[in-house]
């Protein structure tokens, strides 16, 4: 029997390399049985995962699982940094892996790290 | 079941360089990382990097940074690994490997994949 | 880079007897969410290595219950209750914490 239990699809440890400047659509794929839960984005900030109250967010749903997305129109520099999903279900909070996401500055094309050479600054993340 | 099949056996010459490929079955491997790992002859195991087939995201070891490249199709299931200028001391022994993204719950390796470099 | 460490290099045990290796990281294996993401490897001579045991004690599926695994932060452990004839292979610990993921020299068991 599948478990009823609210999941939250974000892999350990996921990185995306982003650019700045343009529209970019982070993801938190939901697995729920009955009643959607309620869910939120939030921001790491050392140990605290800060709330992100005033940002565009959105539901998208597919047959088995719904994805519950934070919008990023366009995506700035200050938005580099890791991020969880959190869902709300029965009284219980269920918080996703942190997933980080580096961002570039606009640049010529030429001149764009390529997403090799982004996965080897470790420091954009501190 | 999980399970990785890596390209046959390569006879290389110095400087020459070489892809070669693992591909994934009995999974969606969009939901798993795939790694590359060394092993020299009668040596031990070293990390080489790992790949997000998901949207193509590579992590390396500091060791193999800039010699090596990984990449992924996921729309036939495959990993990649491109060695360049190929040295003597490449002669080894390449695994794949596929794990669970979310709770690590698999962690499966390919046969592996011999590459003798030789003049 | 974290540093693993195993000890012994190698291990010659009776058949029946229990086998203890042991390995040591550079520093803790706690990650921020709680879990400690240390591995044991098996590799058999002339075969591809396989996982036996992962997040410090659980065992992956079809692992003989013979086999298990201990520890905390810096300090772990594999234990091989009674010793087999197809136990003998090469053990690796390693890291799945932090990036670079490393591994330990590894520790050769024979049998006596």
């Known amino acids: 029997k599948e478990s009823c239990d609210v999941q939250l699809y974000i892999k350990r440890q996921s990185e995306h390399s982003i650019l700045a400047g343009d529209p970019f659509e982070l993801e938190c794929p939901v697995k729920y049985c009955a009643n959607r839960p309620h869910v939120t984005w939030c921001k790491l900030n050392g140990t605290t995962c800060v709330k992100l109250e005033d940002r565009q967010t959105s539901w998208k749903e597919e047959k088995n699982i719904s994805f519950f997305i934070l919008h990023f129109e366009p995506v700035l520099p200050n938005d580099n940094g890791s991020y969880r999903c959190s869902a709300n279900f029965q009284s219980n909070l269920i918080e996703s892996h942190s997933t980080t996401l580096y961002v570039t500055d606009v640049k010529s094309a030429s001149e764009r790290p390529s997403k090799d050479e982004m996965a080897s600054r470790p420091w954009l993340l501190y | 079941e999980v399970q990785l099949v890596q390209s046959g056996a390569e006879v290389k010459k110095p400087g020459e360089s070489l892809k070669i490929s693992c591909k994934g079955s009995?999974?969606?491997?969009?939901?798993?990382?795939m790694y590359w790992v060394r092993q020299m002859p009668g040596k031990g195991l070293e990390w080489i990097g790992r790949?997000?087939?998901?949207?193509?995201?590579?992590r390396y070891s500091p060791s193999f940074q800039g010699q090596v490249t990984i990449s992924a199709d996921k729309s036939i299931s495959t990993a990649y690994l491109q060695l360049s200028s190929l040295k003597a001391s490449d002669t080894a022994m390449y695994y794949c490997?596929?794990?669970?993204?979310?709770?690590?719950?698999?962690?499966?390796w390919g046969q592996g994949t011999l590459v003798t470099v030789s003049s | 880079d974290i540093v693993m460490t195993q000890s012994p290099d190698s291990l010659a045990v009776s058949l029946g007897e229990r086998a203890t290796i042991n390995c040591k990281s550079s520093?803790?294996?706690?990650?921020?969410?709680?879990?400690?993401?240390l591995n044991w490897l098996q590799q058999k001579p002339g075969q591809s290595p396989k996982r036996l045991i992962y997040?410090?004690?659980k065992l992956d599926s079809g692992v003989p219950d013979r086999f298990s695994g201990s520890g905390s932060g810096t300090d772990f452990t594999l234990t091989i209750s009674s010793v087999q004839a197809e136990d003998l292979a090469v053990y690796y610990c390693?890291?799945?914490?932090?990036?670079?993921?490393?591994f330990g020299q590894g520790t050769k068991l024979e049998i006596k």
């Open positions: 390693w890291q799945g914490t932090l990036f670079p993921r490393t």
């Open positions: 997040l410090v004690s």
């Open positions: 490997a596929v794990y669970d993204g979310y709770y690590e719950s698999f962690d499966v």
């Open positions: 520093q803790s294996l706690l990650d921020s969410d709680g879990k400690t993401y």
């Open positions: 790949i997000d087939p998901a949207n193509g995201y590579t």
């Open positions: 009995g999974v969606n491997i969009k939901d798993t990382y």
